[in-house]
């Protein structure tokens, strides 16, 4: 004979569970689907990763998302992951807004963002919900730097990079200080390939590093290069 | 090609100052920094210090953490370089090695500091025990 | 003071390819070189410039440097590649000589 009242709990149906929190009154719920849509913005050495919100909550409120990457080096097709060579806005795992932004990405490596939803049930099941997304990244190479000539008092230097890339930059930024004054630094700012470094101390060396700017932001700064003037004895503009 | 020897004390009691020489055999001797490194047992490379001599003057430069109790000093009749580390202790036990540069430090205005170190002497394992 | 941050442990089967890197705030701006050390012996230069070989050290080892990362790669692994490899780089700040703690590769 039925019941005269209805069963305290019941059992959940197949594919939908109770997680261990969860009070007996509770609604059987499932794992989220996956995020339903995700877009990889590239600018210069980073990614901004967006995405809406699974079209199937499962029933429950408490989703949460994480993000994993793997980088692709493009000469060999060998992927690995890159977690400890990124840097992410905020910790990629238990996030609870649908964005982040990933930053210290190499130029010319692909990259690919997985973005998966859980929620509290998602332990109970082995399969997951997840979204990929991939992105090459193409931020201009570093500049590279030659000392073209120099006096006692000057430096003369030029870079280059691949031509095809030229077109994106609008300005290069030469960043100098003398060798062993950490506290100050002179800045300049130049559309050419080249520049001329002046009103310098003889007989010393100075760390110089060029950087390109694009649209995009700062394209990747060259290596710091070690440059010295002529000292007063060996004076006369020199070429190297 | 150049060639580095080096020799000194092996075996040290705490307190005492620790000495090491490292000859250098070809090559121009002043236009490189010669440095100094260390390996404690089953631990990564320690860099110590540097030193050029060009002209009269020598230009030295030390590992901020042993700065206060290290002097390196050369010989240039002898091109030979020298490492004292004072008051030792059993921290300081490990392999000492002289280290060659790959560059001269400066050619033509552009130079290397911290250059990558080509050549290395042999080695010589200090030992500080009481 | 500027710190370089190397895995401790890298292992490979023979014949494929080994990844070390070597980790620093900006260190692409800088020249990275790398050492092999066997048991009893002095390092070894394998890299220098991030990328160049010595004269002797076979192609097998190459590397790279960008961002915050570089990395040494030895391809096609042997069992006489077993070994510790530190980086190293000049600390334009300090003017000093840093290396990294340096990874054990162990051929499997």
């Known amino acids: 004979l039925p019941s005269p009242e209805g069963a305290t709990s019941c059992e959940c149906e197949e594919g939908f569970f109770r997680a261990p929190q969860d009070p007996a009154s509770m609604p059987c719920t499932r794992p989220p689907s996956a995020p339903h849509y995700l877009t990889a913005v590239g600018m210069g050495a980073k990614v901004e990763l967006r995405w809406t919100p699974p079209q199937d909550s499962g029933g429950r409120e408490d989703i949460v998302y994480s993000v994993t990457c793997e980088q692709c080096w493009p000469e060999s097709g060998e992927c690995g992951p890159c977690e400890a060579s990124v840097r992410y806005s905020e910790p990629p795992h238990g996030l609870t807004r649908t964005s982040v932004t990933v930053s210290d990405l190499e130029p010319h490596m692909n990259y690919t963002f997985t973005v998966e939803a859980r929620n509290g049930v998602s332990g109970l099941v082995t399969s997951r919900s997840f979204r990929t997304a991939s992105v090459s990244i193409n931020q201009t190479e570093p500049p590279k730097v030659r000392l073209e000539g120099r006096s006692t008092t000057s430096l003369s230097v030029s870079w280059s990079i691949p031509p095809p890339q030229q077109s994106r930059v609008w300005k290069y930024e030469v960043t100098y200080r003398k060798k062993g004054d950490s506290n100050s630094y002179n800045v300049r700012r130049t559309e050419g390939f080249s520049v001329t470094l002046d009103d310098l101390a003889p007989d010393t060396t100075y760390l110089v590093q060029v950087q390109a700017l694009t649209q995009e932001g700062q394209g990747a700064g060259s290596k710091v290069h070690e440059f010295q003037t002529l000292s007063p004895e060996g004076s006369g503009n020199l070429a190297v | 090609q150049v060639q580095l020897q080096q020799w000194g004390a092996g075996l040290l009691k705490p307190s005492e100052t620790l000495s090491l020489t490292c000859a250098v055999y070809?090559?121009?001797?002043?236009?490189?920094?010669w440095s100094w490194i260390r390996q404690p047992p089953g631990k990564g490379l320690e860099w110590i210090g540097e030193i050029n001599h060009r002209g009269s003057i020598n230009y030295n430069n030390y590992n901020p953490s042993l700065k206060s109790r290290v002097t390196i000093s050369v010989d240039t009749s002898k091109n030979q370089f020298s490492l004292k580390l004072s008051s030792v202790t059993a921290a300081d036990t490990a392999v000492y090695y002289c280290?060659?540069?790959?560059?001269?430090?400066?050619?033509?205005?552009?130079?290397?500091?911290?250059?990558?170190?080509?050549?290395w002497g042999q080695g010589t394992m200090v030992t500080v025990a009481s | 003071s500027y710190v370089l941050t190397q895995p401790p442990s890298v292992s490979v089967a023979p014949g494929q390819t080994a990844r070390i890197t070597c980790g620093g705030n900006?260190?692409?701006?800088?020249?990275v070189h790398w050492y092999q050390q066997k048991p009893g012996q002095a390092p070894v230069l394998v890299v220098y410039d991030d990328s160049d070989r010595p004269s002797g050290i076979p192609e097998q080892f190459s590397g790279s440097n960008s961002g915050n990362t570089a990395t040494l790669t030895i391809s096609r692994v042997e069992a006489g590649d077993e070994a510790d490899y530190y980086c190293q780089v000049w600390d334009s700040s300090s003017d000093h000589v840093v290396f990294g703690g340096g990874t054990k590769l162990t051929v499997l």
């Open positions: 900006n260190i692409g701006s800088k020249n």
């Open positions: 280290a060659k540069p790959l560059r001269p430090h400066c050619t033509n205005g552009v130079c290397y500091s911290g250059d990558a170190f080509d050549i």
């Open positions: 070809g090559g121009s001797f002043s236009d490189y920094y």
